[in-house]
Interface confidence: medium
Amino acid sequence: LIQERRSHEVNPAAHLTGANSSLTGSGGPLLWETQLGLAFLRGLSYHDGALVVTKAGYYYIYSKVQLGGVGCPLGLASTITHGLYKRTPRYPEELELLVSQQSPCGRATSSSRVWWDSSFLGGVVHLEAGEEVVVRVLDERLVRLRDGTRSYFGAFMV
Amino acid sequence: LIQERRSHEVNPAAHLTGANSSLTGSGGPLLWETQLGLAFLRGLSYHDGALVVTKAGYYYIYSKVQLGGVGCPLGLASTITHGLYKRTPRYPEELELLVSQQSPCGRATSSSRVWWDSSFLGGVVHLEAGEEVVVRVLDERLVRLRDGTRSYFGAFMV
Amino acid sequence: LIQERRSHEVNPAAHLTGANSSLTGSGGPLLWETQLGLAFLRGLSYHDGALVVTKAGYYYIYSKVQLGGVGCPLGLASTITHGLYKRTPRYPEELELLVSQQSPCGRATSSSRVWWDSSFLGGVVHLEAGEEVVVRVLDERLVRLRDGTRSYFGAFMV
C-alpha cells in the first residue's frame, strides 16, 4: 500500500476564535476559544494559547487580529507587532514564523479620533509533532475583541 | 474501501473576481465574475453573489477588497466593514464568519488627498451542502474595482 | 488505479523568505531565499525571483510584504502597489493575478514620523507546468526586510 498522509485520515485543521479571555495582560500569547461557535480542532490540539501539532508536516498557518483605538495616547506603542511564533522542545526560545508591524494610530483623522485596523498573516511552515504555534500582539491593549469573527487563529495541513 | 474526500474526486475550489457589476448599491452582497479571466468554479456553485457549497466539509474561505477614496467626505463612513457571511437554510439571518473593520481615510496625507487601502480576510469554516457564503462591504462606495485582480472572493476545501 | 494528484506524490508547496538580496533596484521582481531558515521548495522550483510550476493545477498563492518608512519624502510614490504576476511562455507580458494598492505614508502621525504597514495577498489561480509567478512592489524602496518573517512568498496546490 502507498503511504500518503491523506489516504486514510482526516487532514489536520483548526480555527480558533477570539474571546473575552483572549487578552491576559500577562505578557503571554493570546488565548483562544476552541469549541464554541466557529471554533474547532481537527487533528490538532490546544494548550494555553497554542495550537499543538500531532502530525508532522507542512501547515498553512494564519491569524487575523482586529485593532482599534482612540488616537495614540502616550504610553501606547505607535507600532503594533502581530506575529505567529513556534515553540519547540529543541530550543528554549520562541521562533518567529510570520510577523507584521503596523502603525495603525495614523488612521485617526481630523474628523474622527477613533480608528480601526486589521492585520492578517498567513504562510506555510513545517511543524513537527509536539511543536506549538502561538499568536502574540504587542501592544495587545489595542486588540479589539467582539464575537470571534474579527480576531482568530488557524491552521491546516497542505 | 477507505472513504476519503480527496481519493477519487476533485477538491472543491473557486476564485471569483470583481467586475463592474459587483457593486449593486442595493444593500445586498457584492456580486462576482465566475468564468472570465482568472475566475473559476470547481465543485462549488454560484448564485447572486454567493458561493454555494455542494459538498460538506471544512473550507478555507477568503476575500480581498481594494478600497480607495479622496479624503473622507461627509456622509461616507469613516469605518469600513468587510466581511464574509454564511447563509444557511436552518437560520433566517446571515451569520458573520470573518470580519474586518478599517479606517482607511486616515491614509490621506497632507500632500495627497487620494488614498488606497486593501482588506484581506481568510479562515477555515465548516460548511454544509446547500449553505452559501457572501461578501459584504459597508460602505461599498469605497470599493475600487478594476480588472478582477484587486477585489476577489474564493474558497477551497481543506 | 484511480489517478489523483494526491494519491502517490507530495502536494506541491513552497514558502520563500525575504533576504538582503531581495531588493535589486533593477525594476525586476523581488528575489527570495529558497533554502535557509523557514524557506523551502517542495514540488516547485525557483528561478530569478519566480516560483516555477512543475505540475499543473490550482494553487493558492500568497505573498506578504513589510512596508516601512519615514513620512513620504519627495519623489517616493505615495501609493504602493504589491502584486503577484504570472509569466507564461504563451504570452510576452506578465499577467496580473492578485494586486493591492496602499497609501501607507498616511500612517505617519504628528507624534511619530516613522510608519509601518503590511500588505498581504492570497488567492487561488490555475497554473500550467512551466508557468512562473513573481512578486513585484512599486516603490520597492519602501519594503523593509529583516529576517525572512516579515516579507515572504509562497504557494501550495489545492
Epitope: - | - | 533596484g25 519615514v70 519623489g75 517616493l76 516613522v114 524602496r141 519594503v143
Partner: antibody, heavy 117, light 107 residues
Framework: QVQLQQWGAGLLKPSETLSLTCAVY????????WNWIRQPPGKGLEWIGE??QYNPSLKSRVTISVDTSKNQFSLKLSSVTAADTAVYYC????????????????WGQGTTVTVSS | AIQLTQSPSSLSASVGDRVTITCRAS??????LAWYQQKPGKAPKLLIY???SLESGVPSRFSGSGSGTDFTLTISSLQPEDFATYYC?????????FGGGTKVEIK
C-alpha cells in the same frame, strides 16, 4: 558620490533675511529629506527644518523651498538677530529601505553666518 | 519635543581605551536614532544609523545599541583620530532633536 554644495551671504544686519542655497550633485533628489541644521559658536546642533516641516522655535521666520529642476533647496530666515549667528549646514536624511533609515548621511561644508550691526 | 540627554558631557580617555557614551530619550523612539562625530571646523559625520547600523566606511570599532529610550555608542578601542565631539539625534518625531554632545578628550 553625492555631494552637497552650499552658499549664501555670510554677514547680515539685524532684521535682515538670511538666504542660503544648497545644491545636490551626483545623486537623486528623490526619496530623501533635505534638511537645514545650525550650530551657534561653541554650542551644539539645532535642527531648523526640512521641506514643509520646521522647528517650532523658528517656524514663524523660516521658509524652506525646493527647486527639483535644479536639484537645489533653499533656506530663508527672516528678521535675524545676533542669536542667529551660527554655522548653517544643509544635510540629506536617508529615508528608504534600500539605503537605511534614521541618519543624516551627507552634509554640506557649512556656511558661517554672522549677524552684527 | 523629544529631549535627548547625553552623558557624560565630556570624558578623558587614552588610546586603546573602551569608551561608552549614552543617550536617553524623554520618550520611546524605537530605533530612530543616529550617532555623529564632529571635529572642530568640520561638518558632523554619520557613524551609526537606525540605532545600530554602521555607516559605510566607518571603522568597525564603532558600534551602536539600544531601542526605545536608552541608547549607547561604543568605541571598542579608542584611536588618536577618534578624539572629537559625539552627538546623538532622534528621527522619530518632529522637531528632530540632537543630544547636547559628548566631548572625548585625550587623557
Amino acid at each position: 558620490q553625492v555631494q552637497l554644495q552650499q552658499w549664501g551671504a555670510g554677514l547680515l544686519k539685524p532684521s535682515e533675511t538670511l538666504s542660503l542655497t544648497c545644491a545636490v550633485y551626483g545623486g537623486s533628489f528623490s526619496g530623501y529629506y533635505w534638511n537645514w541644521i545650525r550650530q551657534p559658536p561653541g554650542k551644539g546642533l539645532e535642527w531648523i527644518g526640512e521641506i514643509n516641516q520646521y522647528n517650532p522655535s523658528l517656524k514663524s521666520r523660516v521658509t524652506i523651498s525646493v527647486d527639483t529642476s535644479k536639484n537645489q533647496f533653499s533656506l530663508k530666515l527672516s528678521s535675524v538677530t545676533a542669536a542667529d549667528t551660527a554655522v548653517y549646514y544643509c544635510a540629506r536624511e536617508i529615508a528608504t529601505a534600500d539605503k537605511g533609515y534614521y541618519g543624516l548621511d551627507v552634509w554640506g561644508q557649512g556656511t558661517t553666518v554672522t549677524v552684527s550691526s | 519635543a523629544i529631549q535627548l540627554t547625553q552623558s557624560p558631557s565630556s570624558l578623558s580617555a587614552s588610546v586603546g581605551d573602551r569608551v561608552t557614551i549614552t543617550c536617553r530619550a524623554s520618550q520611546g523612539i524605537s530605533s530612530a536614532l543616529a550617532w555623529y562625530q564632529q571635529k572642530p571646523g568640520k561638518a558632523p559625520k554619520l557613524l551609526i544609523y537606525d540605532a545600530s547600523s554602521l555607516e559605510s566606511g566607518v571603522p568597525s570599532r564603532f558600534s551602536g545599541s539600544g531601542s526605545g529610550t536608552d541608547f549607547t555608542l561604543t568605541i571598542s578601542s579608542l584611536q588618536p583620530e577618534d578624539f572629537a565631539t559625539y552627538y546623538c539625534q532622534q528621527f522619530n518625531s518632529y522637531p528632530l532633536t540632537f543630544g547636547g554632545g559628548t566631548k572625548v578628550e585625550i587623557k
